[in-house]
Amino acid sequence: TQHGIRLPLRSGLGGAPLGLRLPRETDEEPEEPGRRGSFVEMVDNLRGKSGQGYYVEMTVGSPPQTLNILVDTGSSNFAVGAAPHPFLHRYYQRQLSSTYRDLRKGVYVPYTQGKWEGELGTDLVSIPHGPNVTVRANIAAITESDKFFINGSNWEGILGLAYAEIARPDDSLEPFFDSLVKQTHVPNLFSLQLCGAGFPLNQSEVLASVGGSMIIGGIDHSLYTGSLWYTPIRREWYYEVIIVRVEINGQDLKMDCKEYNYDKSIVDSGTTNLRLPKKVFEAAVKSIKAASSTEKFPDGFWLGEQLVCWQAGTTPWNIFPVISLYLMGEVTNQSFRITILPQQYLRPVEDVATSQDDCYKFAISQSSTGTVMGAVIMEGFYVVFDRARKRIGFAVSACHVHDEFRTAAVEGPFVTLDMEDCGYNIPQTDESTLMTGRA
């Protein structure tokens, strides 16, 4: 767990889309695998904020026990608090569930800072503001943890939506989404719209406000503007993608594109920041500093430690550059770019701001485990995790924070050669050496 970096930080109506069409084999506009259009029952089913994670309401067991569960595309275990903890308002009580089955197996998940451990079992799980289905899923009942749960975050567990390869204790433990797709007619796709407030929210405001939407089994057109652009999922473990170019205010960082993906690039809703490999981070900060040189900030700000405050309503967004990440496209030698604003990478901090001040943390940080496109990136976009077609789609989010001069953007196509060379091939090592926490 890291302070406001890795979350947890490693900080309705029914109606399932049944009997849906499979993707058409056609060169015309490809049909998405899954219903398109309106998913009214799933819209606005997330709450939370980038610094503490976005969560969805789920029920576990019989009779159903309601819990708030962090949506995490950077891990693959469904794990819930199952014992009293000072930061938990409620927890999963296995003894009260007639459908709980013990797998008689433990699981231990260490992060860079902190850990959780628990006991594996299965139970019936459903998502009240999701598809109208119930599935039997693997559950890690967390009995002990350190620096995992976050005080005031209002979630009691984590829904790992990535692939089995990174599940703990090993890839034989089927992740929740795999179980859902296998046991129901829900298409193998989900999409996320994370809505950053753009201003600090206190705890009661978070509870009352909308945090976004997780559309299970499809795409909702009301959640984005413009077109969806897709990038291939390079390998099904994390949601790994390939970045082929980075620009700050249109200025190319001019690095070997392998550096951008060293040792991987992933899309991770459970991480707060945009995290960049050391060399890339240093180059990006140098460029952002140069672009915003009309004002000077302390070193601690660029390290994500110190806050910068302006009088309420006077934040000089215009002095900060836009950041563009070019992603490999679906067509050979074709890429597209996603562009975020300072409104995404300067994260409002609630516990310090007052009515007189707007305070922000710099939400781009250094990584030793590759690029992580965390909540600050995802808050600009509607992101489609099209597992069926092994691709991730990006479109401008209908809820992204912007100003009258600039907006987040998804644009293409651009001609980019030799994009395959941008991927880094991680040397094969014993799987147990995989880092769980992203430092």
Epitope: S293, T294, P298, F301, V308, C309, D351, C359
Partner: antibody, heavy 120, light 108 residues
């Protein structure tokens, strides 16, 4: 070594503008590593931050004084200045100039201070 | 804005005694806290920064500790020249505008 020295009138009439200058000697005000600030201390009271400036002209002001304060820099003279308009007796204080690091962002070097009395 | 509360307001001690000064922040300031010493008629002088690092030329009898909201300045054995007013300041938020109200260390 680097030193800071405040200068300016010790007496200002109410409603007038207080003007002070801080001269930096033994080093350059154009260092990219520092801001240059003003802090004041009313007699027998605590410290109040007024504002600061970077050699390029970028400024930060205390919101409670912002409407009355102007800080400017003259790199050719290695000086920075404070102007506080529409003064009242409540502005009577010892005014200090100081250096603020961007690496270690504290006031690591101070001038001796100059007492400014607002009185008719 | 973050408020810094220093206690006690006055500390009456004899030379050679240990002085313990407290500074409490209304919200966490991480380790971004400094201590200054101010003698009568003089400008403040930076003693400790980043909660526990001694500034250049500061004697080893001065030490700082704490993080988050609670901080302590300790003078292990008071020398006659240590009787002064001590201020804490947070720079967790930029610009660095918040000082504590001060603690006066006087001779008993």
């Amino acid at each position: 070594q680097l030193q800071l020295q405040e200068s300016g009138p010790g007496l200002v009439k109410p409603s007038e503008t207080l003007s002070l200058t801080c001269t930096v000697s033994g080093g350059s005000i154009s260092s990219s590593s520092y801001y240059w600030g003003w802090i004041r201390q009313p007699p027998g009271k605590g410290l109040e931050w007024i504002g600061m400036i970077y050699y390029s002209g970028s400024t930060w002001y205390n919101p409670s004084l912002k409407s009355r304060v102007t800080i400017s820099v003259d790199t050719s003279k290695n000086q920075f200045s404070l102007k506080l308009s529409s003064v009242t007796a409540a502005d009577t204080a010892v005014y200090y100039c100081a250096r603020v690091g961007l690496g270690v962002s504290y006031f690591d070097l101070w001038g001796r201070g100059t007492l400014v009395t607002v009185s008719s | 804005e973050i408020v810094l509360t220093q206690s006690p307001a006055t500390l009456s001690l004899s030379p050679g005694e240990r002085a313990t000064l407290s500074c409490r922040a209304s919200q966490s300031v991480s380790s971004y806290l400094a201590w200054y010493q101010q003698k009568p008629g003089q400008a403040p002088r930076l003693l400790i920064y980043d909660a526990s690092k001694r500034a250049t030329g500061i004697p080893a009898r001065f030490s700082g500790s704490g993080s988050g909201t609670d901080f302590t300045l300790t003078i292990s054995s008071l020398e006659p020249e240590d009787f002064a007013v001590y201020y804490c300041q947070q720079v967790y938020t930029w610009p660095p505008r918040t000082f504590g109200g001060g603690t006066k260390v006087e001779i008993k």
